[in-house]
Interface confidence: medium
């Protein structure tokens, strides 16, 4: 009941609490449980107990084992057991499920990844934090305090992440790196009937001759990722990759999920050098998914050019 | 005509990632989505997950959730499926294979593969 | 999700033969159907669409029908190229495909 497994890299710096509490006020004697052999106090040591903590300065293979700690106090004495594994680094970039701390889940609206242990640590910020062994780069990734937060989670954010610090002890710096895996909850994600936020239904967009004009066609299909949501322009009841001229032509525009997590999509038909022509197509923004299809319809009309008079 | 090449097979190591590509052509890139669906050895199909090159929006199967992850590179029409911690059972040939429906009526639901890479073989082995 | 059956896994037929392979979707899928052949270390193609559209290029002796939760796809005169295996997939929500029917020669 009593018992406490850790774990450590070998050259790393290990710190170990006994698993049995008691004030600060009372003593805690270690032993290495196979000899009965009395931790040193020591800080010269490169194995050495403080108090409640046993600290591996660094830690080497050869020290795994079981560790007794005795929490002394005036009426009575408590016994704990730590299990100490020390490992190998690993040559590759594959965390064996054995160095994993326990996995976290995180949401659109709670994204925090704390580092396992450090609290038993004397380390600085700013923390290092790796996904799969590769460093996090990007303004979605904030390094806070003895945390991780991620900005607009997605399900690609699911992973094993690594915290890496410097533990330092009497001027001397050790290395310490910790990793656990972290799940993404998808928050109810739902899809819905397409719902077209531009254009206006029968919008009338002026445009000058001559002149260079975009519209955009803008959709939302629901929240948490989509099955097939498409957001497109027809000419005439036409695709413009089979409408056939040149001048007029769709790119897609951001993808958008607004802060109340709604997943949405634009298109941006872009006309180049507006001609009289242009002034009698229909212009058709479809949202589709799989509930269904739904079309604004946009025609064109021309800015009078406004007549500057001295 | 439509066509969708892929790249060569992977022999990897269990915990190691894999990106396999697919390229477009014949078509215009950005209307149509793209799917990778796994088949392994003596197996059925198994859908991985979905891109759309207009946006770059993709859903993948919950099996998969937080080991694959598709890009697309619009100025080579080409997607991309990379998955990550792999293990022996992902040992399969990976297609990817273009989705298509009917506007016309009116909704996404009836959509089909209608072309699909070569495969490529990901052979996943200590 | 939304699971699939086919039935039978397996059969035996003769080049001539009508083959009927039947498929079930553990809800009602509408005619949401797909039906797909693959050869040995080939990708699938696309036989049938929306239960019963035949994709273009596809002999007019394989046909598909049923709606709702039970589907068939027919060949009515088995013919050498068409010894393969073939799957059913719903196209209702994010796709599901049938374990697969391997018809083969008797």
């Known amino acids: 009941k009593f018992s406490k497994q850790s774990w450590g890299l070998e050259n790393e710096a290990l710190i170990v609490r006994c698993p049995r509490q008691g004030k600060p006020s009372y003593t805690v004697d270690w032993y290495y449980s196979q000899t009965n052999k009395s931790i040193p106090t020591q800080e010269r040591n490169r194995v050495f107990a403080s108090g409640q903590l046993l600290k591996f300065l660094p830690a080497a293979v050869a020290d795994s084992g079981i560790y007794t700690c005795i929490v002394r106090s005036p009426t009575f004495n408590r016994t704990g057991y730590a299990n100490v594994t020390i490992y190998k680094k690993q040559s590759d970039c594959n965390v064996p499920d054995y160095l994993m701390y326990s996995t976290v889940s995180g949401s659109e609206k709670n994204s925090k990844i704390y580092c396992p242990t450090i609290d038993l640590y004397n380390w600085t910020a700013p923390l290092e934090w790796f996904k799969n062994c590769q460093a996090l780069q990007g303004s979605r990734y904030r390094a806070h305090k003895s945390f991780l937060v991620i900005d607009n989670v997605m399900t690609e954010d699911a992973g094993d992440y690594t915290c890496k610090f410097i533990h330092n002890e009497n001027g001397a710096n050790y290395s310490v790196t910790a990793t656990r895996s972290f799940t993404v909850k998808d928050e109810q994600g739902f899809s819905l009937f397409p719902v077209i936020g531009a254009p206006a239904q029968n919008e009338i967009k002026e445009v000058e001759i001559g002149k260079n004009a975009n519209l955009t066609c803008s959709a939302c299909f629901g929240k948490g990722t989509q099955f097939l949501a498409a957001v497109l322009w027809q000419l005439n009841g036409t695709k413009i990759t089979d409408f056939g001229e040149p001048r007029i032509q769709q790119e897609e525009g951001q993808n958008q999920s607004f802060s109340n997590g709604l997943a949405c999509l634009d298109m941006v038909l872009r006309i180049a050098d507006v001609k009289e022509e242009d002034l009698l197509l229909q212009y058709d923004c479809l949202a589709l998914n799989l509930h269904g299809l739904r079309r604004h319809t946009v025609r064109l009309s021309r800015k009078n050019p406004i007549d500057h008079h001295s | 005509q439509v066509q969708l090449v892929q790249s060569g097979a992977e022999v990897k190591k269990p915990g190691a990632s894999v990106k396999v590509s697919c390229k477009a052509s014949?078509?215009?890139?950005?209307?149509?989505?793209i799917n990778w669906v796994r088949q392994a050895p003596g197996q059925g199909l198994e859908w991985v997950g979905i891109?759309?090159?207009?946006?770059?929006?993709?859903t993948y199967a919950q099996k998969f959730q937080g080991r694959v992850t598709m890009t697309r590179d619009t100025s080579t029409s080409t997607v991309y499926m990379e998955l990550s911690s792999l293990r022996s059972e992902d040992t399969a040939v990976y297609y990817c294979?273009?989705?298509?429906?009917?506007?016309?009526?009116?909704?996404?639901?009836?959509?089909?593969?209608?072309?699909w890479g070569q495969g490529t073989l990901v052979t996943v082995s200590s | 999700d939304i699971q699939m059956t086919q039935s039978p896994s397996s059969l035996s037929a003769s080049v001539g033969d009508r083959v009927t392979i039947t498929c079930q979707a553990t809800?009602?899928?509408?005619?949401?159907l797909n039906w797909y052949q693959q050869k040995p270390g080939k990708a699938p193609k696309l036989l049938i669409y929306?239960?019963?559209s035949l994709e273009s290029g596809v002999p007019s002796r394989f046909s598909g029908s049923g709606s709702g939760t039970d589907f068939t796809l027919t060949i009515s005169s088995l013919q050498p190229e068409d010894f393969a295996t073939y799957y059913c997939?719903?196209?209702?929500?994010?796709?599901?495909f049938g374990p697969g029917t391997k018809v083969d020669i008797k």
């Open positions: 294979a273009r989705v298509n429906y009917d506007i016309l009526t009116g909704q996404g639901r009836g959509y089909y593969f209608d072309y």
């Open positions: 014949g078509y215009t890139f950005s209307t149509y989505d």
């Open positions: 891109i759309s090159p207009s946006g770059g929006w993709t």
């Open positions: 809800q009602d899928i509408a005619d949401y």
């Open positions: 929306k239960a019963s």
């Open positions: 997939q719903q196209s209702y929500s994010t796709p599901t």
